[in-house]
């Protein structure tokens, strides 16, 4: 009996609302033994892979995907999957990245911290009601 692959989780640092031109890092987490993490943008057709996997805890591994300068084109839903030989996992829940114009005002927070989509809860409701399809139909395009 092969072991079940737990659903991965995804989170964003410093948050999911990012000012234009600022950086964001998506953190994908899965079990130990993951060979490849994949960050998908809206669908399985547009993605970025990494084998730079680190151990986050005795039972968990992670990979980090950084976008140095966020543009409006980076907004949209993201999710993670991973490859633990010989199988690909299911996808994580979606995490919606929002990009906002920098207002420069002293009262406007830069980010919305603490957003993540975990493996066991109901579908995360941090996605907004409407969004444009992201790079629909492109095959194996890099995210950035």
């Amino acid at each position: 009996q092969e072991e079940d692959l737990p659903r991965p989780s995804i989170s964003a640092e410093p948050g999911t609302v990012i000012p234009l031109g600022s950086h964001v890092t998506f953190v994908c987490r899965g079990p130990v033994g993951v060979q490849t993490f994949r960050l998908e943008r809206e669908s399985r057709s547009t993605y970025n892979d990494t084998e730079d996997v680190s151990q986050a805890s005795p039972s968990e591994s992670e990979a980090r995907f950084r976008i140095d300068s966020v543009s409006e084109g980076n907004a949209g839903p993201y999710r993670c999957i991973y490859y633990k030989p010989p199988k690909w996992s299911e996808q994580s829940d979606y995490l919606e990245l929002l990009v906002k114009e920098t207002s420069g005002g002293p009262d406007s927070p830069d980010t919305e911290p603490g957003s993540s989509a975990g493996p066991t809860q109901r579908p995360s409701d941090n996605s907004h009601n409407e969004h444009a399809p992201a790079s629909q139909g492109l095959k194996a395009e890099h995210l950035y």
Partner: antibody, heavy 121, light 111 residues
Amino acid sequence: EQSVEESGGDLVKPEGSLTLTCTASGFSFSSGYYMCWVRQAPGKGLEWIGCIHSSSGNIYYASWAKGRFTISKTSSTTVDLQLTSLTAADTATYFCARDSEVYGWNPNDLWGPGTLVTVSS
Amino acid sequence: ELDMTQTPASVSEPVGGTVTIKCQASQSISSYLAWYQQKPGQRPKLLIYGASNLASGVSSRFKGSRSGTQFTLTITDLECDDAATYYCQCSYYGNSYVGGAFGGGTEVVVK
């Protein structure tokens, strides 16, 4: 061209059993797709039975289908739906459907033509 | 157990008219909602995915929207070819709370 096709539909007696097969072509299960079974009784609506994730092997069932219906991956290109303790209410066209290659949010955009199961004495 | 309540069961509108179909999820499903069109004797056809995104090759007369756990399919400028039954479906298979439940369907008659 990518496609899925169901087979195995038949006339079966009440309390009988049947195994339906969904055969995929033009794509690889190893990439990880949700392969789902949906049924439709004559003149009625669509009813979700369950799905198997073709790579991880994780399976999800509608609560009413648990115990009586079993989904399994039987090869790199086939998924089976085993039906047991059949009654007349199980008479339906059974569809196999795969979630999307190019769209997020896991909609089923690839459907087979369906196979008819008739339960009657 | 996830329940998808779809209304109305049937609607009749003239050519050129507008039809609005609603689907209420009994719990949060984020945007994991698809709309399908099915004609008699045919397999379902995907129209909308992710609550509001148009599938390839589908007319822009079809529009999906979401407000919390309520989802809406709007068909504008009705054509005779739009006569069919429309179904919503939760397309999330992630855990024991939700699954792929369909709404009961809406028959659209074009006069």
